[in-house]
C-alpha cells in the first residue's frame, strides 16, 4: 500500500495491480484530504476471490468509525458483494481501505487469477452547513445560533443584523449599537421584527451611500413601537437623522410617512426601556442618483461614443476621434478618455479636443533618401514619402511579388506611423549594386604586359599591406574577398598578429593611403586552407568584414559572384588587376592584365614539366598561357580574376589570384570562387 | 505457524538511542501492516503505533517524535529516542489482521536506568 | 479521544461458572473491536475480533457481543486454564492516535 499524502485527488491499487494479487497479505490505506473537504472514492476496476460474506479475500472501506462496506467478486459473479460504481463518501477527510486475502485463490482446484482493484479517490467539499441531524450522525461540530456560510474548505458563522458573534465564533448576542449599512438599497428592522424587540436596547442604524445619492425611507407595515396616550414616545422611541439633523421621533402603530431625506447620511437611533411586547419596526430605503450635464463636443472631430439622453452620477462617457485625430487635453495626448459623473452633478474632466495625427520626421534611409509625394515637409495623417536609393550604386530591396509602383512609399497611418503596405513600419534597404563600373575598362586593344588602370575601371579593388602587399575584391559595401595566403602566407608561422590595412578608392597607392584604411572587424578564412602545407593552395579564399560599411561611389563598387560554370570556358577573357610587381618594379599604380582561362590539362602537364609538386585542384583553374608575356604578379595576390558576364553586363569575380604567379613566367593559378560561393554566402549571412 | 519475535531489549540509559527489531516466521512482513505495543511492569497494553506495507507510519500522539517505526523486507524496526525511565517496559510487535493484532511475538524487555 | 472503559476491574469466578467483562467506548466504533487474553509473562492471544468473531484455535465458550459503544466479552462454563488478564481494543487506530485502542484490562482469578 502507498502512503497517501493530502492530495485533493488521486489513486488506489491492489498490489501488483493489474496483475494478480499476492496470497496471504491485508493491509490498510488511510486516504487523507485536507480538512473541511470529505472524501469521495470510487471503485474503477474491481476484480476479488469471490467468497459467501467476503470470507476469504475482501477489501473493507470505512470512514468515521464505521464500516462502509466488505467487498469482494466482481460484477456478475453469483457469490461476493462487488462494490460496483457505488460512491463511498466521509463524513471527516479521512477513509480507511483495508485490502485482506487469504492462503490461496482456488476454485474447484483450479488456481485462478484475480487482478485486484483500482480505485480513484477526491476529495469533496464538506458542507458544515447542512443539517445532519436527519442522519443521526454527531456533528463534530458546534453548530452556529443564527447563520452558517459553507465554503470549499470549511464553514464560518455570522449573526443576523443586531447581534455580534461572539468569541467561540458561533453564538450570537444583542449588539446594535453600531450597525451600518452601505448599499444602495436595503431593508433595515428592529431586533427579531415582526416579533417582540428585546428590552433595553441602544440602537444606532447608520445608512452611508456615496455622496451623489440621495436617501428615501418607506416603512412597512407592522409599525408597533411602545407608546403613552398623553406622553410623546416615553418608554421606546425610534429617532431619525438625515446629515446629522432630527427630521422625526416615532412611536405607536401609526407607520411614519415616507421620508426623502435628500441627504446621503442618515442614522436611526432606537431605544427600549426594560419591559413591553410591541412588534417593532420595518423600513425599505433606496437612493436616487444626482444628473450631469449633456457633453459636448469643441470640434468636428471629436466623438462622443453611445451618446445618452442623460447622464446621472458614476454614468460616464467615452470620447474618441475621427480617423487620424488624436485626443489633447492642454497639451497633453491622450490615449482615451473617459468622464465621469460626479456627485455634485459635475464631470471630473473637461471635454477634450481632437488634433491630427503627426507622423514625425521620416527616418533617414542609409544610401538613400526620400521625397514628398505630398506637400512638402508635412508629416500629418495620409502624408506620402517615396524613399529612393542613391543610383546606380544601390537599388532597393524589393520582395517578391511586391507591386513596383508601392515600392518605397509611405504613408502617415492613423496610428501615427509611416507605412509601408508591404513592409509596414520598415524603412526599405538600399542594397548595394555588384559588378556595374560607371567606367567599365576597354576591351577591344590585345594588351601584351598590362597597362595602368584608369579610374573606375576596378572599383572593387582592394590595396591590402598585411604581409606586405595584396589585393582583394570588396563583396557589398563591408566585405573584402581576398586570398587566404595574404594572411596566412605559406612561409610565415601559423600565429601571426600582423596588422590588417585595408585601402579602396582609388588607382594611387599614394592617394589610397590618404584616404586611408578600413578597419577589420572579423577575419574569416576557409577550413580548408592548410599554412603549413607549402604546396597546397586549397581553400586559397578568405573574408574581411569591414568595421562599418563603405559608401559606394563611382570609383568603389562591389563585385558580382559567379553563379554558373559558363565562366570558366576555356578562352574566356578576364581581367586580373593589382598593385603588385610590374617589370621587378613595385607598382604605385593599379595595373591590370587581360588573361584567358586555360585548358586545365595543359597547365597539369605544364606544371610536371616543371618537376613542381603544387597541388591543382577542382577548386582551382589557370590562365594565361605559357607564351603570353603577361601574368599576375606577387602583390596581386589575393586581387580577383574578373569576367564580364554577357548576359546581363555584370563583372564577375570568378577566381582569386592564389599561386604559380611568375610574373609574366608561365600560367597563374586561381581559387575557382564557384566552388566557394555558398561558404561566401554563408559567412556573409551571419553577420547581417 | 505464524510467529513473530522481538530482540535488541535490554539495559539502556536514559538519553541514549535503543533500536528493537521485529522478525516473522510463517509468514512475510511486507504482506501486513505492523504494531508495536508495549506494556509496563504490572500494567495495562499501551499501543505505539503501526506501519503499513507501503511504509507509512502511523503513532499514537503521545508516542509522536519519541518512537520511529520503520521497516525493510525482514524486520520492523522500533527505535526509541532519549528513552526515559517511564519507557521501561516489555515492548511487543504484533501483526494487524481483522482490525486486531494477531500473533504477537514474546516481547523484548527494555529498561531504563542510569 | 476515543477512550475504552473496561469493567470490573476484576472478578472472581467458580469453575463451570459465568463471567461477563463489559467495554464500553465513549464513542461509536462500530463493531470494530477485538478481546485478548493474556496471561503472566506471556503476551496477548486474540480471542474474539469484529465484536463476535472467534478466533482460530478459541473455544467456543468464549462469546463476544454488542455494537456501537456496549460490548462483553461472555467466558461460561469457565475452567482454571482461564485465569487471566482480558483486554478489549477497537481497530480504529488508524484515525484516532490521539487516544489508546485497549481498554485498562480485567483480571480473572479462578476459585
Known amino acids: 500500500s502507498i502512503p497517501i499524502p493530502q492530495k485533493l485527488f488521486g489513486e488506489v491499487t491492489s498490489p501488483l495491480f493489474p496483475k494478480p494479487y499476492p496470497n496471504n497479505f491485508e493491509t490498510t490505506t488511510v486516504i487523507t484530504v485536507p480538512t473541511g473537504y470529505r472524501v469521495k472514492l470510487v471503485f474503477q476496476q474491481f476484480d476479488l476471490e469471490p467468497s459467501e460474506g467476503c470470507f476469504y479475500d475482501y477489501v473493507k472501506i470505512s470512514a468515521d468509525k464505521k464500516s462502509l462496506g466488505r467487498f469482494c467478486g466482481q460484477l456478475g459473479s453469483p457469490l461476493g458483494n462487488p462494490p460496483g460504481k457505488k460512491e463511498f463518501m466521509s463524513q471527516g477527510n479521512k477513509m480507511l481501505l483495508t485490502f485482506h486475502t487469504d492462503f490461496s485463490n482456488e476454485e474447484n482446484g483450479t488456481i485462478m487469477f484475480y487482478k485486484g482493484f483500482l480505485a480513484y479517490y477526491q476529495a469533496v467539499d464538506l458542507d458544515e452547513c447542512a443539517s445532519r441531524s436527519k442522519s443521526g450522525e454527531e456533528d463534530p461540530q458546534p453548530q452556529c445560533q443564527h447563520l452558517c456560510h459553507n465554503y470549499v474548505g470549511g464553514y464560518f458563522c455570522s449573526c443576523r443584523p443586531g447581534y455580534e458573534l461572539q468569541e467561540d465564533t458561533h453564538s450570537c448576542q444583542a449588539e446594535c449599537s453600531s450597525e451600518l449599512y452601505t448599499e444602495a438599497s436595503g431593508y433595515i428592522s428592529s431586533l427579531e421584527y415582526p416579533r417582540s424587540y428585546p428590552p433595553d436596547l441602544r440602537c444606532n442604524y447608520s445608512i452611508r451611500v456615496e455622496r451623489g445619492l440621495t436617501l428615501h425611507l418607506k416603512f412597512l407595515e407592522p409599525f408597533d413601537i411602545d407608546d403613552h396616550q398623553q406622553v410623546h414616545c416615553p418608554y421606546d422611541q425610534l429617532q431619525i437623522y438625515a446629515n446629522g439633523k432630527n427630521i422625526g421621533e416615532f412611536c405607536g402603530k401609526q407607520r411614519p410617512p415616507d421620508l426623502d431625506t435628500s441627504s446621503n447620511a442618515v442614522d436611526l437611533l432606537f431605544f427600549t426601556d426594560e419591559s413591553g411586547d410591541s412588534r417593532g419596526w420595518k423600513l425599505r430605503y433606496t437612493t436616487e442618483i444626482i444628473k450631469c450635464p449633456q457633453p459636448k463636443t469643441l470640434d468636428e472631430f471629436t466623438i462622443i461614443q453611445n451618446l445618452q439622453p442623460q447622464y446621472q452620477f458614476r454614468d460616464y462617457f467615452i470620447a474618441t476621434c475621427k480617423q487620424g485625430y488624436q485626443l489633447i487635453e492642454g497639451n497633453q495626448v491622450l490615449h482615451s478618455f473617459t468622464a465621469v459623473c460626479q456627485d455634485d452633478g459635475t464631470w471630473h474632466r473637461a471635454m477634450p479636443r481632437c488634433k491630427i495625427k503627426d507622423c514625425g520626421q521620416p527616418r533617414n534611409l542609409p544610401n538613400g533618401d526620400f521625397r514628398y509625394t505630398t506637400t512638402m515637409g508635412v508629416n500629418t495623417y495620409k502624408a506620402r514619402i517615396q524613399y529612393y536609393c542613391h543610383e546606380p550604386y544601390y537599388k532597393m530591396q524589393t520582395r517578391a511579388g511586391s507591386r513596383e509602383s508601392e515600392q518605397g512609399v509611405y504613408t502617415c497611418t492613423a496610428q501615427g506611423i509611416w507605412k509601408n503596405e508591404q513592409k509596414g513600419e520598415k524603412i526599405p534597404r538600399c542594397l548595394p549594386v555588384c559588378g556595374k563600373p560607371v567606367n567599365p575598362v576597354e576591351q577591344r586593344q590585345r594588351i601584351i604586359g598590362g597597362q595602368k588602370a584608369k579610374m573606375g575601371n576596378f572599383p572593387w579593388q582592394v590595396f591590402t599591406n598585411i604581409h606586405g602587399r595584396g589585393g582583394g575584391a570588396l563583396l557589398g559595401d563591408r566585405w573584402i574577398l581576398t586570398a587566404a595566403h595574404t594572411l596566412y602566407p605559406k612561409e610565415h608561422e601559423a600565429q601571426s598578429n600582423a596588422s590588417l590595412d585595408v585601402f579602396l578608392g582609388h588607382t594611387n597607392v599614394e592617394e589610397l593611403m590618404k584616404l586611408g584604411n578600413h578597419p577589420i572587424r572579423r577575419v574569416s578564412v576557409h577550413p580548408d586552407y592548410r599554412q603549413d602545407e607549402s604546396y597546397n593552395f586549397e581553400g586559397d579564399i578568405a573574408l574581411l568584414e569591414l568595421e562599418n560599411s563603405v559608401t559606394l561611389g563611382p570609383n568603389l563598387l562591389p563585385i558580382c559572384l559567379p553563379d554558373n560554370d559558363t565562366f570558366y570556358d576555356l578562352g574566356l577573357m578576364g581581367y586580373v588587376s593589382g598593385f603588385g610587381v610590374m617589370e621587378e618594379k613595385i607598382a604605385h599604380d593599379l595595373r591590370f592584365v587581360r588573361l584567358p582561362v586555360a585548358n586545365p590539362q595543359a597547365c597539369e602537364n605544364w606544371l610536371r614539366g616543371k618537376n613542381r609538386m603544387d597541388v591543382f585542384s577542382q577548386n582551382m583553374f589557370c590562365a594565361g598561357h605559357p607564351s603570353l608575356k603577361q601574368d599576375a604578379c606577387q602583390g596581386d595576390s589575393g586581387g580577383v580574376f574578373a569576367v564580364r558576364d554577357p548576359n546581363t553586363d555584370r563583372w564577375v569575380a570568378t577566381g582569386i589570384v592564389s599561386w604559380g604567379i611568375g610574373c609574366s613566367r608561365g600560367y597563374g593559378f586561381y581559387t575557382k570562387v564557384l566552388n566557394y560561393v555558398d561558404w561566401i554566402k554563408k559567412e556573409m549571412e551571419e553577420e547581417d | 505457524q505464524e510467529q513473530l519475535k522481538e530482540s535488541g531489549g535490554g539495559l539502556v540509559t536514559p538519553g541514549g538511542t535503543l533500536t528493537l527489531t521485529c522478525t516473522a516466521s510463517?509468514?512475510?512482513?511486507?504482506?501486513?501492516?505492523m504494531s508495536w505495543v508495549r506494556q509496563a511492569p504490572g500494567k495495562g497494553l499501551d499501543w505505539i503505533g503501526i506501519?503499513?506495507?507501503?511504509?507509512s507510519a502511523y503513532y499514537a500522539t503521545w508516542a509522536k517524535g519519541r518512537f520511529t517505526i520503520s521497516k525493510t523486507s525482514t524486520t520492523v524496526d522500533l527505535k526509541i529516542t532519549s528513552p526515559t525511565t517511564e519507557d521501561t517496559a516489555t515492548y511487543f510487535c504484533?501483526?494487524?489482521?481483522?482490525?486486531?493484532?494477531?500473533?504477537w511475538g514474546p516481547g523484548t524487555l527494555v529498561t531504563v536506568s542510569s | 479521544a476515543q477512550v475504552l472503559t473496561q469493567t470490573p476491574f476484576s472478578v472472581s469466578a467458580a469453575v463451570g461458572g459465568t463471567v461477563t467483562i463489559n467495554c464500553q467506548a465513549s464513542?461509536?466504533?462500530?463493531?470494530?473491536l477485538a478481546w485478548y487474553q493474556q496471561k503472566p509473562g506471556q503476551p496477548p492471544k486474540l480471542l474474539i475480533y469484529?465484536?463476535?468473531d472467534l478466533a482460530s484455535g478459541v473455544p467456543s465458550r468464549f462469546k463476544g457481543s454488542g455494537s456501537g459503544k456496549q460490548f462483553t466479552l461472555t467466558i461460561s462454563g469457565v475452567q482454571c486454564d482461564d485465569a487471566a488478564t482480558y483486554f478489549c481494543?477497537?481497530?480504529?487506530?488508524?484515525?484516532?492516535?490521539?487516544?489508546?485502542?485497549f481498554g485498562g484490562g480485567t483480571k480473572v482469578e479462578i476459585k
Open positions: 464513542e461509536s466504533i462500530s463493531s470494530n
Open positions: 504484533g501483526r494487524k489482521i481483522n482490525d486486531a493484532f494477531d500473533p
Open positions: 469484529d465484536a463476535s
Open positions: 506501519i503499513n506495507t507501503g511504509g
Open positions: 481494543q477497537h481497530g480504529w487506530i488508524y484515525d484516532t492516535i490521539d487516544s489508546n485502542c
Open positions: 510463517g509468514f512475510s512482513l511486507s504482506s501486513y501492516d
